[in-house]
Each structure stands twice: as C-alpha cells, then as structure tokens.
Interface confidence: medium
C-alpha cells in the first residue's frame, strides 16, 4: 500500500479551498493540528481540519446531496407535471367542445327549447368539468338531473306546444313522470354508464399523474439524516484535511454510501415500478365507453336520439301525462 | 348550480369541426407519455449509482479515497476501510424509511389498486351489453369516419378523435425547460463545492 | 425561488375597471392552474376565480359571475384578473395563488403559493 | 355551498402552551380540509393539507387531525412566531370556502 502523501505543512491548500465554503478564515488551523476534538474526518496523524470545518462539510455535504437527488429527478418531474397540465387542459377542452356540440344539436334542431336547455346543457357540463377536477359529485345524478330539467321543456315546447300558461306548474310532476314513465327509454341508464366509465377513468388517471408529481416532490425535499451526512463529508471532504484536494473517492466506497443514505428512498421503488406499470394498463384500456373523449364528443347524438325517442311515442306519453299530473296542485308527484 | 365556466359557446362554427388536423390524439399522447416513463421505471432503484457517477469518483486515477486513506482503485480496501470503526451502516438500513417516504409509498399503495381495479377485464363486461341492448350505432363501424349521430339535420361527422391538441400549447418554452425555472438554484457558496 | 409579484391596485370609483396583474417565477407557470383569492378588510379569505394551466377553462365565484375576467399569458409567466363594474363590496386585499394537487381529491383548489396581496379599494 | 365555523374567534395563550384550534363543516368534506396561517400584513401560508398532512418546511409542532365534518389543528408549544389568524379551508366540495378564521394571541 502506497504511504499517503505528506499534508500540506502549512494547511494553504486547505485554507483557500475553505474559504470558498465559508468566507472568512478563523477556523482553518495555521498549521496541521492534532485533530483530537474531530468526530467525523478522524485524524491519523496532524490534520488541517477543526470541528467547526467539519460541522461546514457535512451542511455542505447534505446540500450537495439534495442538489444531487433534485437534478436526478429533474428530467422525471418535468416530465409528469408537463403532462398532467396538459392532460387537465385537454380534458378541460374536450369538455368545452361537448358542450357546443350539445348546444348546436338544440339550436338546430330543437330551437323552440332554446334557451333553456343552453342552460341545463351549462350546467350539466360544468359537473363534468368539476367531477374531472375531483369535486364530490354523483354522476347519476349529474344525468338525472340534465333529464329531469329537459323534459318539462321538451313536454310543454315539443309535444304539447298549445298548453296553457296555467298549466305551466305541473314542472314537479313532469319531473317526476320522466322516471317512473321512462320517458327517455333505455338513454338516460346509457348515458350514465358511459358517462360514469369514462370520467371515472378520466379521473383516477389525472389524479395518478398528480400523485407522480407529489411522490418526485416527496423524494426530492428529502432531509439527510445525520448519520447520511457524516459518511458523506468523509467521502467527500475528509480527504482535504489530510491536504489531499485532488484525491476522487472509490467507485465501490461511494455506491455503499448512496446506497446507506438513500435506504428509505429504494423501498419506493417497489411501488413505483407497480406505477407505471399499472398506469399502462388503464391507459390501454382507455378506449370506448373508457375514453371520455369519445364518450362525451358522442353525447350530443345520443340526447338527440333520446329525444327522438319522446317524440316518437309522444301521442301515448301525452295522453297519460295528461291525466297523471292534471291534478298536481294536489299532488306533488315528487 | 351558480358557480360554472364563463359561456364557450361558439355558435355556427361548430358544426364545421374546423380543428386543425394533428397527428396526436389524446390517446396517442397518452401512449407515448407511458412509453417515456417507462424508461424511469428504474429510476429510485438507480438513484445510488446515477448520484455517484454524477459525483466525483475516481475513473481513471490508480489511486481514490475510501474514507480513512489512499488506496488502489481496485484493491478490497476500497470499498470496505472507510465504514470501518465509523458507524453501522447496517444500522442505517434498519431505520426504515423517512415517516414522509412511508406516507408517499402508502398512497402509491392505494392508486395501484386503484389503477388495477380500474383495469379490470372483469370490469368491462358491460361493453357487451350494451351491444346487446341496441345501443350502438347500426350504420357506424368502428372505421376511421366515425359517425357522431344518427338522423336529422345539422348532424355532423366528426374524423375518428377530435386531433385538438394543436390548441393546446403544451410544446415547452424555454423558461420552463429543464435548467431555467426548474433549477434549485442555492446560494453560490454553498454549493458545487466538489473540488475537481 | 418561486415568487408571485402582484401589481394592479388602487382606488377606484364604484362602476369603475381595474386589472391586476401577478408575475409568477421560479417554477413552471404554464403547468399549474392560477387562483384569485381576495379578503376584505379586518374579514376572511374568498375565493374569487380560478383558471386552468392553459386557460381553457375558468371559474368564479357568484359574487363577480358577469363582472370579472381571469386571464393567463403563458408566455409572459403572468395571470390577469380583470374587474369590472366595481362595486363597494369589492373592496379587499387580492391575492392570487397557485392551484396544487396532493393526492386524493384530485382538484386544484389548494392554494401552495401566494403574491403578496393587492389592495383594492372602491369608494365614491 | 359548504360552510365552515371555526372555533374559538379568539384563543389567548402564552408561548409553550398548546393550542387547539376547531374547524366545523356544515356537511361532510372527506379529508380535503386544509389549515393556513396568516400574519398581519401578510399572504397566507398553507400549513396542513388533508386534514393531516404537513405541507413542505412547516415544522412539527403543527398537526391537524379529522374528518368528515370536525377537524381540529394543534400547535404543540407556541412559539412566538405562531401568534396568527388560522384560517381553514374545504376543497371537496364546489366552490373552495374558507372558514371565518381564529386568531391566536398573546395571552
């Protein structure tokens, strides 16, 4: 084994080197000392280091550590947060273009219900949209609810146009009707199926990629534990006490201290590979009545089939709604 | 409900579908987000190896620090006399992970289940059903013209997916790219201290 | 460091306009939904408005629905609000404040980072 | 919308003692309640999220617990940079609402 070489016997090289550290160059010994008080660069002979240029290295060695760990992750986090903006974004734009293509439907085919159905088309959509953002709302009675609204438009403007306005207080009854008779058939059950899929999917994808952001952030802020920076200041820096600045540590020594230091983060890993992994599998499934941009660019179409429905069986419908809500003053169907 | 998004409605333009033709759907940036995290599946269990050679390490030099003294590269020493007498490093292992990484790797439990439940063959069932039940449309296969509606006027046929992603303008600026904003950027004097 | 500069307030008449700006920097704006917060003098925080990282979307209280406008300016690092037919109620301090996500709800209106507050006064 | 009432408006104590501030929703929030302190002249600054999570650099004296529609923050030992207005705040529901704050003061 080679002898180590002579410290510097003045400690110059060690000084000037400090003083980028901490300006100012009180701590720095003149001269090599015995080096009795140090805890962590233990001295084998005279040594250039005091406990206060120790107590420095390991700050500096921890804040070295977090750079490290920050500029790792860089390329990871960007990633994510790059594409989970974009994806709310799309999802955000999607919903915006249902939504016009719903209210073109009316105006172009239904313009008499304008514009109460722009309204109950609104505010449907705006559900959509918060239910995306992760507000607790029921899709069922996001469906209902657009349903519920339309009908008494659809039965006092489409199917019983000369209705007198006396007769305009039977909303609560017709809202009712619309359940109990099926006015809408099977639509209104179809409808909530793909609507419930895909934004339940649309949902638990951009909360995964959020959570991707959060466990990178997690992992990034870490604080080294005590025991991690000692063993990383004598990697890194117990070498310029002995004046041996150019000195680079063994490959095999620093793999055994990263992997000491960094033992809580590894266990992450399990579940991170199972992340991604997962992560592929919902994206591959995300297709038809599980892609939302299919499903709500669709939307517009199958409430016009459902109100293509009511007006097919209008006469019947009429007829028993006629004598269902003629007395809904007395009795409130609902 | 009161509280809802300033009114988009964008009238008669809508019918024409005058989105930009652009090769990325939805589903495709999706598939190619998963194929770029792909490659960082590794990424924690690789986080030890990539800090070291992203630290000095002695490459080429016959001689490399192993905590206490000089030795060769590639003698036992190496590795081993520098944990010697300092502190148990097996001891370190035993600690357990931070109490914030035992939180993050709980919720990364949680969507995991969550994502293979939501994955599910089981789960798609209905799609059968509602072939059964008549609700597809009959006149429209699963071609690249997918119909959007059936009869009536102002129908409108839209190309397969609507390609809007060109609106939005997710290609990075140079403020946000890695580097610029991104960048922990501590005091001069307190970091990049390695001495090379 | 992340920082929101706000700028903007003032005295104005009741019916009057104004239009606050907030510069955001040290961190990627155009990745994370905005939020306007305004609090009233000697009372408690409101939220105002809210819009998404590419500003396809924006939502507001009640309170302004009609009055005010959220805007973005991806390429500036900037967020706008602007305020029309100001009325006396409208007076406050406003902050605007980045949308976060932690994992769980999955919606946006968690507000991480704040501007230093604008105030904003409206009196005849 | 959801609203929230905290309890006390005021809470009047001596560094080092503990502070138990309370946090009421009128209908069930899950865990998505979030805690801010805010200082004199000052922008708020988020403290916990979901009910009990700790936000980046808030030291531990500060915890938060609950769920459902009671939720409380505790400050283990005052020190004397935590005399502040706390303000909570609900994300479960549309529109985000604030509680009416409660202001922690030297006794």
């Known amino acids: 084994q080679p002898p180590p070489p002579p410290p510097d016997a003045t400690c110059h090289q060690v000084r000037s080197f400090f003083q980028r550290l901490q300006p100012g160059l009180k701590w720095v010994p003149e001269t090599p000392v015995p080096g009795s008080d140090l805890q962590v660069c233990l001295p084998k002979g005279p040594t250039c280091c005091s406990r206060k240029m120790e107590e420095k290295y390991q700050l500096t060695a921890r804040l070295n550590m977090e750079q490290l760990l920050q500029s790792a992750s860089m390329e990871l986090k960007f990633l994510i947060i790059q594409n989970a903006a974009v994806f709310q974004e799309a999802f955000e734009i999607v919903v915006r273009h249902a939504k016009n293509y719903t209210n073109a439907m009316f105006k172009n085919n239904y313009p008499s219900l304008t514009p109460q159905a722009f309204e109950f088309v609104g505010e449907f959509f705006t559900d959509v949209s918060l239910y995306i953002l992760g507000s607790d709302i029921n899709v069922d009675d996001m469906v209902n609810e657009l349903f519920d609204s339309l009908f008494p438009v659809i039965y006092t403007q489409l199917m019983n146009p000369g209705l007198p306005d006396s007769a305009l207080d039977i909303n609560e009854c017709l809202r009712g009707a619309r359940r109990d008779l099926k006015v809408f058939g099977n639509f209104p059950k179809l409808i909530m199926t793909q609507v419930s899929k895909s934004l339940q999917v649309t949902r638990i994808f951009l909360q995964a990629l959020n959570l991707g952001i959060e466990v990178i952030n997690t992992t990034d802020h870490l604080k080294f534990s005590k025991d991690c920076g000692r063993m990383l200041t004598r990697m890194w820096y117990c070498s310029y006490c002995q004046g041996l600045m150019m000195v680079k540590p063994c490959g095999g020594y620093c793999n055994v201290v990263m992997q000491g230091c960094m033992a809580g983060v590894v266990e992450i890993d399990k579940y991170w590979r199972e992340y991604i992994l997962s992560l592929e599998e919902l994206v591959n499934g995300m297709y038809r009545i599980y892609d939302m941009e299919n499903v709500l660019l669709g939307l517009f179409s199958t409430i016009h089939d459902s109100i293509q429905y009511v007006q097919k069986n209008a006469g019947k419908l009429t007829t028993t709604i006629g004598k269902l809500c003629a007395h809904s003053q007395q009795r409130q169907y609902r | 409900s009161a509280y809802y998004p300033e009114d988009l409605f964008i009238d008669k333009k809508v019918l024409k579908v005058a989105h930009v033709e652009h090769e990325e759907t939805l589903s495709s940036r999706r598939r190619e987000l998963i194929q770029k995290l792909k490659s960082f599946i590794s990424f924690y269990s690789a986080l030890p190896g990539y800090i070291c050679s992203h630290s000095p390490v002695a490459e080429n030099d016959t001689l490399c620090w192993n905590g206490q003294e000089l030795v060769e590269r590639y003698s036992q020493k190496a590795a081993r006399n520098g944990m010697k007498n300092q502190f148990n490093l097996h001891e370190l292992k035993m600690k357990g992970p931070e109490p914030v990484v035992s939180q993050i790797i709980d919720k990364l439990k949680h969507i995991n289940q969550l994502l293979r439940t939501m994955s599910m063959p089981k789960g798609r069932v209905l799609d059968k059903n509602l072939d059964e039940e008549g609700f597809e449309s009959g006149d429209c296969g699963d071609d690249e013209d997918e119909c959007i509606g059936g009869s009536g006027d102002g129908m409108i046929k839209v190309k397969n997916q609507l390609r809007f992603l060109a609106e939005l303008a997710y290609d990075l600026d140079v403020d946000d790219a890695p580097g610029n904003s991104q960048q922990a950027t501590p005091k001069d004097n307190e970091i990049s201290t390695f001495h090379n | 460091q992340m920082q929101l500069v706000q700028s903007g307030g003032g005295l104005v008449q009741p019916g009057g306009s104004l239009r606050l700006s907030c510069a955001a920097s040290g961190f990627s704006f155009s990745s994370y939904a905005m939020n306007w917060v305004r609090q009233a003098p000697g009372k408690g925080l409101e939220w105002v408005s809210y819009?998404?990282?590419?500003?396809?979307?924006?939502y507001y209280a009640d309170s302004v629905k009609g009055r005010f406008t959220i805007s973005r300016d991806n390429a500036k690092n900037s967020l706008y609000l602007q305020m029309n037919s100001l009325r006396d109620e409208d007076t406050a301090v406003y902050y605007c404040?980045?949308?976060?996500?932690?994992?769980?709800?999955?919606?946006?209106?968690?507000?991480?980072?704040w501007g230093q507050g604008t105030m904003v006064t409206v009196s005849s | 919308e959801i609203v929230l009432t905290q309890s006390p408006a005021t809470l009047s104590l001596s560094p080092g003692e503990r502070a138990t501030l309370s946090c009421r929703a009128s209908q069930s929030v899950s865990s998505y309640l979030a805690w801010y302190q805010q200082k004199p002249g000052q922008a708020p600054r988020l403290l916990i999220y979901?009910?009990?999570n700790r936000a980046t650099g808030i030291p531990a004296r500060f915890s938060g617990s609950g769920s459902g529609t009671d939720f409380t923050l505790t400050i283990s030992s005052l020190e004397p940079e935590d005399f502040a207005v706390y303000y909570c705040?609900?994300?479960?529901?549309?529109?985000?609402?604030f509680g009416q704050g409660t202001k922690v003061e030297i006794k």
């Open positions: 979901d009910a009990s």
């Open positions: 819009i998404t990282s590419g500003g396809s979307s924006r």
């Open positions: 705040q609900q994300r479960s529901n549309w529109p985000p609402t």
């Open positions: 404040a980045r949308g976060t996500y932690y994992y769980g709800s999955g919606n946006y209106f968690l507000f991480d980072h």
